[in-house]
Interface confidence: low
């Protein structure tokens, strides 16, 4: 999906008002210095590409993020403010349904959400200092 057509300011507002708080809630009890940020992004469309990938694509050791509150709100924001985004997510939704129903917060998931927090912060001030 080409995220260059999204309404970035509206997505930013959604992040600041709710998604950021849900990410903090998910990470509660974890030290902010526990994980190093290894994923970065250079422009807001690029940031959204990375955010979508980390939020909705199951990874080894963390298959359940898509059902979290921050993920559902992220999906809603992208669906509302990125034209045509919903249509591209039909296959992704099917994959999400196959994901395990129980929410398991593994260390790998915590690390992944820590990366997401960094990506969202970069989304708000996105210019990569050095490619």
């Amino acid at each position: 999906y080409d995220f260059t057509n999204c309404d970035f300011e509206k997505i930013k507002a959604a992040y600041l008002s709710t998604i950021s708080k849900d990410l903090i809630t998910y990470m509660s009890g974890t030290k902010s210095t526990e994980f190093n940020n290894t994923v970065s992004c250079s422009n807001r469309p690029h940031c959204l590409t990375e955010i979508q990938s980390l939020t909705f694509n199951p990874t080894a050791g963390c298959a359940s993020l898509a059902k979290e509150m921050f993920a559902m709100k992220t999906k809603a924001a992208l669906a509302i403010w990125c034209p045509g985004y919903s249509e591209t997510q039909i296959n992704a939704t099917q994959a999400m349904k196959k994901a395990r129903k129980s929410k398991v917060t593994t260390n790998k998931c915590l690390e992944q959400v820590s990366q997401l927090q960094g990506l969202w912060r970069r989304f708000n001030r996105p210019l990569l200092k050095q490619q």
Partner: antibody
Framework: EVQLVQSGAEVKKPGASVKVSCKAS????????MHWVRQAPGQGLEWMGM????????TLIQKFKDRVTMTVDKSTSTAYMELSSLRSEDTAVYYC??????????WGQGTTVTVSS | DIQMTQSPSSLSASVGDRVTITCRAS??????LAWYQQKPGKAPKLLIY???TLAEGVPSRFSGSVSGTDFTLTISSLQPEDFATYYC?????????FGGGTKVEIK
Amino acid sequence: EVQLVQSGAEVKKPGASVKVSCKASGYTFTTYWMHWVRQAPGQGLEWMGMIDPSDSETTLIQKFKDRVTMTVDKSTSTAYMELSSLRSEDTAVYYCARTLDGYYDYWGQGTTVTVSS
Amino acid sequence: DIQMTQSPSSLSASVGDRVTITCRASENIYSYLAWYQQKPGKAPKLLIYFAKTLAEGVPSRFSGSVSGTDFTLTISSLQPEDFATYYCQHHYGTPWTFGGGTKVEIK
């Protein structure tokens, strides 16, 4: 209204330094990066580097690394670009421009720097 | 560094003409390209960013498109105020680089 107002024209001798200022208004200074671009007479645009006003981190292209210093004064929302060891080929119009995603939505009016003995 | 090759370097056209300027990137920059218009003695003015998004206040006769690493700026019907020099610039990552410029002159 967003404005970037630059300092006036300068005439300098070879080997001297020049410091160009760029005063920002109409937006939150620390939210946007400030870039500097120069244009020699009759030539195209050349990117020099950028500074992040929130933490003063700078990125400069290799050719300017030894001669350019970029700074900001957050209290006055002003960015500065100092170019040292001036030579005749530094004669150009110097622009500041703000950016969030890498394209420049607002530019300063330009500062003409003439290097002549 | 990413090189931006802009063509033509100059062109002559009449009011009402359709004008096309192209810019080729030396590597994939996706949609991270901006177009600017510059008039003598003035700072450049943003026309288009993300290859095809029109900047605020820019007339709809300006449009941008992308095909791979080739980018196009089109002026559908040239107006007297459009005679100027146009630059492309990639905004994919540092160092930012500009094309050499295209001067649009009156025929």
